[in-house]
């Protein structure tokens, strides 16, 4: 359906709040450099612009798509060179061109200060004195650092901010009434990044056909009631979405997640009967629940998949006929009978389906050459199974701090080169599984815990994308996405490293260390670990863990002292000494 | 949708030859191993002979082993079948069907009668 002005049309449908909310979302996460104030005055200016154009749609440049409006202010910024370098170079170029070229300078670890939160008083007075700006600015300096995040949901997420405010800042306890929800906010936002971070990268990086497979496994999953050509619909509707979210198009993407959660709720009876509560929320809440809503019970006796894709003789008249559907077809059928696989298995199983039909549909006695290809999907089913199985009860035995100590060891062994800090980051990421997925019952681990992985090693690979070091991370990251995870499994110790020269200055610590807080300290110890692995990559985890509980030791000992610095720079010394001499430095 | 096309059918006497052809569309008929199938009145559909897709591999059912031969030609997407020393038993419809699948074509009549 043309409009005349694409502005005014979603002026109109998203309303003016929104609108404001998702162009300051895609002004920032374009420009991640440039200041707050900077950001909402060329919001204001679009906005009085839009205002124009739905009082007439005819007014001058209304007729211009939403690119060229947004990219020709954008361009006006004044420090554009200064501040980004060849990014300025955009804007000599058309659209779509100059679109592509502010995509490709998106940063994914942007050089920008930690968020500090403020005492709760100040942030209480500030909501108070301008509660707009204050919510503006949440908006503002998460979108910056995550220039990925699904907006439509960031309007979520500064709902529930702003509903906490509101009812904390009159609470007796403030702090208690507000710290544990902006910590859940804080913990739920990184999560929520990180997964809208895989699905853009599965776009951009394999194409809209490997979303789409992605997505029927997991649609399937949740709606196992639903028809094929439903959950067909539903792919198709979902992969422009996230399409236009992932390409910056933030007004199309909230706009269309609007028409399918109107779409599901109006048809839930041929999808699911868990969306009655998800449909009774006003918009945003609808929209994250839906998202989020478990999955449906599968119907009772579905037939054997051997019959349709095994047995027929049809088999490759039906591969023929529509490739991708036929696939779509096995994808659907193969996903809503297994809740309890990861949608990351699915995929493999299908991939694994389509290479032996390609391979048999050719032979003169394709059946003979097929008959045994669900044979071939028990190893590629067992491997997560016991990968999982042994992790948990690794998991179990260590704790979550001393798991991820374990995978630190193991993956700065897999790739050294990789900087400290992702290292750390990733690793306490992984770890992370422990308490996220080993807590399930069997059927629901696998899921849990493979999913959640491909997140996080997503950020691996969107990390070292920005300065590659180690090819084995490009290899892995690149060669298949749904085989990363067994990828990354699968590397040993990389011999061709040669250990980092020994720095004192990388293992001297200072009192500071005493007034972090507990998970801070924690990364401190775990980027020393990295460090020695760096320095000494064939340690055993004897000699690791002897060193480690040294420093725990030392660092207890010195914050307990009098005179913490001198402790640490005495004991410190001592400490060096030792490990040097217990890893044979 | 697959489109197959059969040809080539006719009356032929005991002993004559006849030549088939299939035209394949809608389909990438190169990677896709092939089949002839006959159904004669009154009974079951019987599979006749099979290609691979590169045409290193042809079956034959024992029927017609030595009288007919597969081939086909991946540039036109054509499957061929050559019949020779025909029998009034050879008498069916014949079809092209993908893999050893079941017919959706119209396939040819073959009448071999004196």
């Known amino acids: 359906d043309a409009h005349k002005s694409e502005v005014a049309h979603r002026f109109k449908d998203l309303g003016e709040e929104n609108f404001k909310a998702l162009v300051l979302i895609a002004f920032a996460q374009y420009l991640q450099q440039c200041p707050f104030e900077d950001h909402v005055k060329l919001v204001n200016e679009v906005t009085e612009f839009a205002k124009t154009c739905v009082a007439d749609e005819s007014a001058e440049n209304c007729d211009k798509s939403l690119h060229t409006l947004f990219g020709d202010k954008l361009c006006t910024v004044a420090t554009l060179r200064e501040t980004y370098g060849e990014m300025a170079d955009c804007c000599a170029k058309q659209e779509p061109e100059r679109n592509e070229c502010f995509l490709q300078h998106k940063d994914d670890n942007p050089n920008l200060p930690r968020l500090v939160r403020p005492e709760v008083d100040v942030m209480c007075t500030a909501f108070h004195d301008n509660e707009e700006t204050f919510l503006k600015k949440y908006l503002y300096e998460i979108a910056r650092r995550h220039p990925y995040f699904y907006a439509p949901e960031l309007l979520f997420f500064a709902k529930r901010y702003k509903a906490a405010f509101t009812e904390c800042c009159q609470a007796a306890d403030k702090a208690a009434c507000l710290l544990p929800k902006l910590d859940e906010l804080r913990d739920e936002g990184k999560a929520s990044s990180a997964k809208q971070r895989l699905k853009c990268a599965s776009l951009q990086k394999f194409g809209e056909r490997a979303f789409k497979a992605w997505a029927v496994a997991r649609l399937s999953q949740r709606f196992p009631k639903a028809e094929f050509a439903e959950v067909s619909k539903l792919v198709t509707d979902l992969t422009k979405v996230h399409t236009e979210c992932c390409h910056g198009d933030l007004l199309e993407c909230a706009d269309d997640r609007a028409d399918l959660a109107k779409y599901i709720c109006e048809n839930q009876d041929s999808i699911s009967s868990k969306l009655k509560e998800c449909c009774e929320k006003p918009l945003l809440e609808k929209s994250h629940c839906i998202a989020e809503v478990e999955n449906d019970e599968m119907p009772a006796d579905l037939p054997s998949l051997a019959a349709d894709f095994v047995e027929s003789k049809d088999v490759c008249k039906n591969y023929a006929e529509a490739k991708d559907v036929f696939l779509g077809m096995f994808l659907y059928e193969y996903a809503r009978r297994h809740p309890d696989y990861s949608v990351v298995l699915l995929l493999r199983l299908a991939k694994t389906y389509e290479t032996t039909l390609e391979k048999c549909c050719a032979a003169a006695d394709p059946h003979e050459c097929y008959a045994k290809v669900f044979d071939e999907f028990k190893p590629l089913v067992e491997e997560p199974q016991n990968l999982i199985k042994q992790n948990c009860e690794l998991f179990e035995q260590l704790g979550e701090y001393k798991f991820q100590n374990a995978l630190l060891v193991r993956y700065t062994k897999k790739v050294p080169q990789v900087s400290t800090p992702t290292l750390v980051e990733v690793s306490r990421n992984l770890g992370k599984v422990g308490s996220k997925c080993c807590k399930h019952p069997e059927a629901k681990r696998m899921p849990c815990a493979e999913d959640y992985l491909s997140v996080v090693l997503n950020q691996l690979c969107v990390l070292h994308e920005k300065t590659p070091v180690s090819d084995r991370v490009t290899k892995c990251c690149t060669e298949s996405l749904v085989n990363r995870r067994p990828c990354f499994s699968a590397l040993e110790v990389d011999e061709t490293y040669v250990p980092k020269e020994f720095n004192a200055e990388t293992f001297t610590f200072h009192a500071d260390i005493c007034t972090l807080s507990e998970k801070e300290r924690q990364i401190k110890k775990q980027t020393a670990l990295v460090e020695l692995v760096k320095h000494k990559p064939k340690a055993t985890k004897e000699q690791l863990k002897a060193v480690m509980d040294d420093f725990a030791a030392f660092v207890e000992k010195c914050c307990k002292a009098d005179d913490k610095e001198t402790c640490f720079a005495e004991e410190g010394k001592k400490l060096v000494a030792a490990s040097q001499a217990a890893l044979g430095l | 949708a697959v489109q197959l096309v059969e040809s080539g059918g006719g009356l032929v006497q005991p002993g004559g030859s006849l030549r088939l052809t299939c035209t394949a569309s809608q389909f990438t008929f190169r990677s896709f191993g092939m089949s002839w199938v006959r159904q004669a009145p009154g009974k079951d559909q019987e599979w006749v002979s099979a290609?691979?897709?590169?045409?290193?591999?042809?079956n034959y059912a024992d029927s017609v082993k030595g009288r007919f031969t597969i081939s086909r030609d991946n540039a036109k997407k054509m499957l061929y079948l050559e019949m020779n020393s025909l029998k009034p038993e050879d008498t069916a419809v014949y079809y092209c069907v993908i893999g050893r699948g079941s017919p959706s074509s119209p396939g040819t009549q073959v009448t071999v009668s004196s």
């Open positions: 290609i691979s897709a590169d045409s290193s591999t042809k």
